[in-house]
């Protein structure tokens, strides 16, 4: 089940998915002046079985100005991931995200890709938030958001993160990149009488205004 909305935005914060659930799609987009090769994939798809997940298809871009006689070949995502994890593996790296059951890691760059990547997330996807450079977490609970299905509708949980200017006192001076966990923290969702938040109002408005598949874009 695809998530209908974008993850929530937080002032002076940025989010990333550290690993992508099976079923996630990534559009194959090229930057200006380039286009997908003829017969090239429209998207990459995170697929797999219980023991291993990887991106199906590969994105390839070629110059719009030239005839498509020679393909610009980009290594298979699987091949790239292999290179990433075996060539001088850093001892300080967290557990390889690809080892999470049912998850793919961030696909490596491909030549002349678009600046923004457009992902289609699925229910259960988690994204992690950090304050951008120059800002610090002043007060926070879980700094992540999970796409959940509640009463037949998808919604993203609200991350508890406030980012403030560097000069102000920070209760959380040390922030580290979280290791992706397969599922979000369990939340009590036994009742349908959920308090309506600003975020819920915004997402419900967005959902009613949406006429086509909602795409999630981030750099």
């Amino acid at each position: 089940e695809l998530c209908d909305d974008d993850p929530p935005e937080i002032p002076h914060a940025t989010f990333k998915a550290m690993a992508y659930k099976e079923g996630t799609m990534l559009n194959c987009e090229c930057k200006r002046g380039f286009r997908r090769i003829k017969s090239g994939s429209l998207y990459m798809l995170c697929t797999g079985n219980s023991s291993h997940s990887s991106w199906d298809n590969q994105c390839q871009c070629t110059s719009s100005a030239t005839r498509n006689t020679t393909k610009q070949v980009t290594p298979q995502p699987e091949e790239q991931k292999e290179r990433k994890t075996t060539e001088m593996q850093s001892p300080m790296q967290p557990v390889d995200q690809a080892s999470l059951p049912g998850h793919c890691r961030e696909p490596p760059p491909w030549e002349n890709e678009a600046t923004e990547r457009i992902y289609h997330f699925v229910v259960g996807q988690m994204v992690y938030y950090q304050c951008v450079q120059g800002y610090r977490a002043l007060h926070r609970g879980p700094a992540e958001s999970v796409c959940k299905m509640t009463h037949g509708k998808t919604r993203w949980t609200q991350p508890q993160l406030i980012c403030t200017g560097e000069m102000e006192t920070s209760q959380f001076p040390g922030e580290e990149k979280p290791q992706a966990s397969p599922e979000g923290r369990p939340e009590s969702e036994t009742s349908c009488l959920v308090t309506t938040t600003d975020f819920q109002i915004q997402t419900e408005m967005a959902a009613t205004m949406e006429t086509s598949i909602f795409t999630t874009e981030y750099q």
Partner: nanobody, 130 residues
Framework: QLQLVESGGGLVQAGGSLRLSCTAS????????IGWFRQAPGKEREGVSY????????YYIDSVKGRFTISSDFAKSTVYLQMNNLKPEDTAVYYC???????????????????????WGKGTLVTVSS
């Protein structure tokens, strides 16, 4: 195939300078943080510096602040690390790396410090003799 190619390493005396280059032809720099890690023999790899392709914000590990400067020439698909006043403790293999930016082109230095990058170069050796 998209690769990161480092150059500029070598042997230099303490107090000297070197400029490392990392070329990534075909990389859409605007979507990435690009920069340098280093690994000294028997030590963990550490994130030295990066520059973001979205707004050119920079980061440096404390031990190189004021001595190293990162810059970019995206027209040449290249990022540079100017290293001045080198010390013996800067001796290491220096690796170029890229990491995808977060939403709205934002980036957090903790992501770089984690060392979980999307693509690595093969490295260039820098040796500083005393």
């Amino acid at each position: 195939q998209l690769q990161l190619v480092e150059s500029g390493g070598g042997l230099v005396q303490a107090g000297g300078s070197l400029r490392l280059s990392c070329t990534a032809s075909g990389l859409t720099f605007e979507g990435y943080a690009i920069g340098w890690f280093r690994q000294a023999p028997g030590k963990e790899r550490e994130g030295v510096s990066y520059i973001t392709g979205s707004d050119a914000s920079t980061y440096y590990i404390d031990s190189v602040k004021g001595r190293f400067t990162i810059s970019s020439d995206f027209a040449k698909s290249t990022v540079y690390l100017q290293m001045n006043n080198l010390k013996p403790e800067d001796t290491a293999v220096y690796y170029c790396a890229v990491d995808r930016l977060g939403s709205r082109g934002g980036y957090a230095s903790s992501w770089w410090r984690s060392g979980d990058m999307d693509l690595w170069g093969k490295g260039t050796l820098v040796t500083v003799s005393s």
